[in-house]
């Protein structure tokens, strides 16, 4: 169950997709990736208040137990629900190759 | 890539499976679940230091960007990599039913 999308903390404060610009150097890829030189990294950032975008039953349980035992059980966390692929031009033993990474760019977010 | 399982923060401090005992009342299930009365909830808790149990390329990117921009990009988060099913005896409109939930108990953890 993908629960409420209304953020009680105010607009943009809850779990959602953000874009962070990063160079190959930032990512530690400069020695093995030729292109792209800069990546618009989409990632999931934000708070996960009670039942906000709860990914599944486990997330709902986590919310309940966090309310009861906040020092023991952390709140649910904002993570990718799905990904967009990304193609890199990378160095190989024989030269250069195209490689698709299916788990690189977040496409959608939920709390778990 | 499931990266290093060695926790640099000390034994038990990094992302791993924990068991938290919870009653139906704790979970808010008392009005619709008959059994079990108490659940040994397995969940993923702990820190995700650099490359510890990195789930995928996205987690590796997140680690790199968190190091560069800690106020903007959060560290990876400890979440279930897989689940164990759990059967509940629950109340229904017509009486009582067995229901299997596939996403209730964490089986394995990783950082993402």
């Amino acid at each position: 169950a993908r629960n409420g999308d209304h953020c009680p903390l105010g607009p943009g404060r809850c779990c959602r997709l953000h874009t962070v610009r990063a160079s190959l150097e930032d990512l530690g890829w400069a020695d093995w990736v030729l292109s792209p030189r800069e990546v618009q990294v989409t990632m999931c950032i934000g708070a996960c208040p009670s039942q906000f975008r709860a990914a599944n039953m486990h997330a709902q349980i986590k919310t309940s137990l966090h309310r009861l035992k906040p020092d023991t059980v952390p709140a649910p966390c904002c993570v990718p629900a799905s990904y967009n692929p990304m193609v890199l031009i990378q160095k190989t033993d024989t030269g250069v190759s195209l490689q698709t990474y299916d788990d690189l760019l977040a496409k959608d977010c939920h709390c778990i | 890539a499931r990266n290093g399982d060695h926790c640099p923060l000390g034994p038990g401090r990094c992302c791993r499976l924990h068991t938290v005992r919870a009653s139906l009342e704790d979970l808010g299930w008392a009005d619709w679940v008959l059994s079990p009365r108490e659940v040994q909830v397995t969940m993923c808790i702990g820190a995700c230091p650099s490359q510890f149990r990195a789930a995928n390329m996205h987690a590796q990117i997140k680690t790199s960007l968190h190091r560069l921009k800690p106020d903007t990009v959060p560290a990876p988060c400890c979440v279930p990599a897989s689940y164990n099913p759990m059967v509940l005896i629950q109340k229904t409109d017509t009486g009582v039913s067995l229901q299997t939930y596939d996403d209730l108990l964490a089986k394995d953890c990783h950082c993402i």
Epitope: L34, S35, P36, R37, N84, P85, M86, V87, L88, I89, T92, D93, T94, G95, V96, S97, L98, Q99, T100, L105 | -
Partner: antibody
């Protein structure tokens, strides 16, 4: 000696299909990306697509759906399957090693001599 | 879709003169660009890769420059064997990958 040799061209009717082969020798196909390019008579070059060493395929938008690139590493051969052929697909079809915009180690300029496909009724 | 646009379509140059060919990409392709020379009945011959790196066996009178969307091929002093058609090729990668050639520039004797 490193070589690329295209075959399978010829005359085909509109709406028909054809499979071109690119047999390579002198290197292990599994280690390289391979590109298909075509050239209509008296016209410019047209990029068709690439198959990577890992087997992923990438196509020009106009080629998606009609053209399929595959490879058989055991036979050291790359294929271009062309379906629903039209008169405008008449061209010389070339295979080339690598992604072309960056050089592989060793020989930088490995192209076959091309095979002519004529689509006509 | 990525589109590569070459200019001019034809360039008339005297032997010994300098020739400058342009190629523009519709997307930022960084340095994912190569230049090819082609003569009738022959496959293309790689001159420049990675926008500015001279391919092996290519004379130093050929040079490439640019990155992003604007690229240039320069032939510093045209020799008789340089009269041919020149093509640029760009490859764009992000969520997928696609390549495209420019329409070509014919370098002819003035």
């Amino acid at each position: 000696e490193v070589q690329l040799l295209e075959s399978g061209g010829g005359l085909v009717q509109p709406g028909g299909s054809l499979r071109l082969s690119c047999a390579v020798s002198g290197f292990s196909l599994s280690s390289y990306d391979m590109t298909w390019v075509r050239q209509a008579p008296g016209k410019g070059l047209e990029w068709i697509g690439i198959i990577s060493g890992s087997g992923s395929t990438y196509y020009a938008s106009w080629a998606k759906g009609r053209f399929t690139i595959s490879r058989d590493n055991s036979k050291n051969t790359v294929y271009l399957q062309m379906n629903s052929l039209r008169a405008e697909d008449t061209a010389v079809y070339f295979c080339a090693r690598g992604i072309l915009v960056y050089a592989d180690y060793g020989d930088h300029n490995l192209w076959g001599q091309g095979t002519l496909v004529t689509v006509s009724s | 879709d990525i589109v590569m646009t070459q200019s001019p379509a034809t360039l008339s140059v005297s032997p010994g003169e300098r020739a400058t060919l342009s190629c523009q990409a519709s997307e930022d392709i960084y340095t994912n660009l190569a230049w090819f020379q082609q003569k009738p009945g022959q496959p293309p011959r790689l001159l420049i890769y990675a926008a500015s790196t001279l391919a092996s066996g290519i004379p130093a009178r050929f040079s490439g420059s640019g990155s992003g969307t604007e690229f240039t091929l320069t032939i510093s002093s045209l020799q008789s064997e340089d009269f041919a058609v020149y093509f640029c090729l760009g490859v764009y990668t992000y969520i997928s990958a696609e390549g495209a050639f420019g329409q070509g520039t014919k370098v002819e004797i003035k």
